[in-house]
């Protein structure tokens, strides 16, 4: 989802090669607002560098949907995980109180 | 093969104007941010201008601010500069450059395409 | 406005020698925003270097740069024939301009 953008455009030049899913480490949209009144994507690479892609290219578009994607994906991994530890909380704490019981 | 070729240059009076052309082949010419840089005769090179590959983002140097304009028309491929009330201090070669590709505000890809330079005299 | 200083202005030296370009900013630069350029007489400048270290398209491997902060290097392994030329540094400054050193001048000794 498009980010509103403080301050004016940042993009001089856009990227012309094919940037592959595995070397994104960030992928920003920022949104036209009225300091800019174009759509603007900006790729962070694993290596640190950051890019501006051309938001008019069909690659870039499908880049943008396997990169949302994937970050749903993570969060819904992530939620699952919190979900379990929460679980797993629950299961010790029952054990507990049956122990004292027990004891 | 991806090339740049400035026009326009000449000897002007000072106070008058001079429209530099830079046209640009080889290459997506759109999708590039264009820059003017300058050497006067014997001396290092200076920026003038730079303009966004949409022409949305225009910057100048100090020195020629109020008085130059850079444009671009990217349905020809050509790069301009409007250069009014000249000064004798004008007087250089004028270069046009590209900005590397994917430049944005943190990163800076260089100039890695020059033209060949104009000259403009600016004398009386 | 961040000023760049470039030493030696000449530096004259053999072929197969190694040279070692200073470039000096009056304020802290960000890396991302040094660039280095060789320039021959009669001829458009070339970009060698971009980032302060990343070597631009076709430059070869005996060109290198380094540096953070207000101190930037270029360095030339080995220099052959036809490296002997002008070389500027350059920063994308936050204004934003793009300011060049003075030049350092490498001739033949």
């Known amino acids: 989802t498009p980010v509103v953008r403080k301050g004016r455009c940042s993009c001089i030049s856009t990227n012309q090669g094919t940037i592959h899913l595995q070397s994104l480490k960030d992928l920003k949209q920022f949104a036209p607002s009225p300091s800019c009144e174009k759509i603007e994507i900006i790729a962070t690479l694993k290596n640190g560098v950051q890019t501006c892609l051309n938001p008019d290219s069909a690659d870039v578009k499908e880049l943008i949907k396997k990169w949302e994607k994937q970050v749903s994906q993570k969060k819904k991994q992530k939620n699952g995980k919190k979900h379990q530890k929460k679980k797993v909380l629950k299961v010790r704490k029952s054990q507990r109180s049956r122990q004292k019981k027990t004891t | 093969q991806v090339q740049l070729v400035e026009s326009g240059g000449g000897v002007v009076q000072p106070g008058r104007s001079l429209r530099l052309s830079c046209t640009a082949s080889?290459?997506?010419?759109?999708?590039?941010?264009m820059h003017w840089v300058r050497q006067a005769p014997g001396k290092g090179l200076e920026w003038v201008a730079v303009i966004s590959y949409g022409g949305d983002i225009k910057y100048y140097a100090d020195s020629v601010k109020g008085r130059f304009t850079i444009s671009r028309d990217n349905s020809k491929n050509t790069l301009y500069l409007q250069m009014n009330s000249l000064r004798a201090e004008d007087t250089a070669v004028y270069y046009c450059?590209?900005?590397?590709?994917?430049?944005?505000?943190?990163?800076?890809?260089?100039?890695?395409?020059w033209g060949q330079g104009t000259t403009v005299t600016v004398s009386s | 406005e961040i000023v760049l200083t470039q030493s030696p202005g000449t530096l004259s030296l053999s072929p197969g020698e190694r040279a070692t370009l200073s470039c000096r900013a009056s304020?802290?630069?960000?890396?991302?925003?040094l660039a280095w350029y060789q320039q021959k007489p009669g001829q458009a400048p070339r970009l060698l270097i971009y980032?302060?270290?990343s070597r631009a398209t076709g430059i070869p491997d005996r060109f290198s740069g380094s540096g953070s902060g207000t101190d930037f290097t270029l360095t030339i392994s080995r220099l052959e024939p036809e490296d002997f030329a002008v070389y500027y540094c350059?920063?994308?400054?936050?204004?934003?301009?793009?300011?060049f050193g003075p030049g350092t001048k490498v001739d033949i000794k």
């Open positions: 304020q802290s630069v960000s890396s991302s925003y």
């Open positions: 080889g290459f997506t010419f759109s999708q590039y941010g």
């Open positions: 980032g302060a270290s």
């Open positions: 350059q920063q994308y400054g936050s204004s934003p301009i793009f300011t």
């Open positions: 450059a590209r900005e590397g590709e994917g430049s944005n505000i943190y990163y800076y890809y260089g100039m890695d395409v």
